[in-house]
Amino acid sequence: EQAPGTAPCSRGSSWSADLDKCMDCASCRARPHSDFCLGCAAAPPAPFRLLWP
């Protein structure tokens, strides 16, 4: 349970101070210095790929 007044971001997202909204942490792979990436706890897993066609 979140404390009152905390940022309402779901798992895998983080609050952007500049945009004043939650942003998807997956985008930090491409732009790691975006402000909200500071709040992304761990690197998101690499996208799943089939090893055969």
Partner: antibody, heavy 120, light 103 residues
């Protein structure tokens, strides 16, 4: 209990290097961003650098960019600040702090501080 | 971030009103208290939410570029330096501080 214990300060000559450490305990270290903040004698607080929980995103104040490097060793629950090309104006008490993203990036747990003196 | 006044001289029991002004619009602001020889202590996050263990005589308000920290009735332990802090453009920034001293 939640704790940050700092080490590594001391006296260094201008142009020299120093590494500060901050050992975390009592919380899941990887879940939190961390930051370094400094305070020159008799002056206010100045943010130095911050790093995300994974270590994949780093941020620096303009005054230290290119000279200081923030890093973390998550298995060891330890935060570092490597300081190179030190100047007299880097003399300060350095604090490590835990950053709460869900607190809109407020810092809720602080180390005890370590004094770095840059002087010849 | 510009804090005013630089020093506030008040007596215990009085109300303290501290100002923090940003040069550009800020979405949320944080306040800290620092006593001599101690590390800062988180007071208010997200402009108006009290951190754990902070008494309700401390309150934060404001929006845009103007923010306020109010201490309704000063206790002896409240005499300290107070800093505001923002996070903008991937930079954390502190105000210069306001010292609340005993009159």
């Amino acid at each position: 209990q939640v704790q940050l214990v700092q080490s590594g300060g001391g006296l260094v000559k201008p142009g020299g290097s120093l590494r500060l450490s901050c050992a975390a305990s009592g919380f899941t270290f990887t879940s939190y961003a961390m930051s370094w903040v400094r305070q020159a004698p008799g002056k206010g607080l100045e943010w130095v650098s911050a790093i995300s929980g994974s270590g994949g995103s780093t941020y620096y104040a303009d005054s230290v960019k290119g000279r200081f490097t923030i890093s973390r060793d998550n298995p060891k629950n330890t935060l570092y600040l490597q300081m190179n090309s030190l100047r007299a104006e880097d003399t300060a008490v350095y604090y490590c702090a835990r950053v709460r993203a869900n607190y809109y990036y407020g810092m809720d747990v602080w180390g005890q501080g370590t004094l770095v003196t840059v002087s010849s | 971030l510009t804090q005013s006044p630089g020093t506030l001289s008040l007596s215990p029991g009085e109300r303290a009103t501290l100002s923090c002004r940003a040069s550009q619009s800020v979405s949320r602001l944080t306040w800290y208290q620092q006593k001599p020889g101690q590390a800062p202590r988180l007071l208010i996050y997200g402009t108006s939410s009290r951190a754990t263990g902070i008494p309700n005589r401390f309150s934060g308000s404001g929006s845009g570029t103007d923010f306020t920290l109010t201490i309704t009735r000063l206790e002896p332990e409240d005499f300290a330096v107070y800093y505001c802090q923002q996070f903008r453009n991937s930079l954390l920034t502190f105000g210069g501080g306001t010292k609340v001293e005993i009159k």
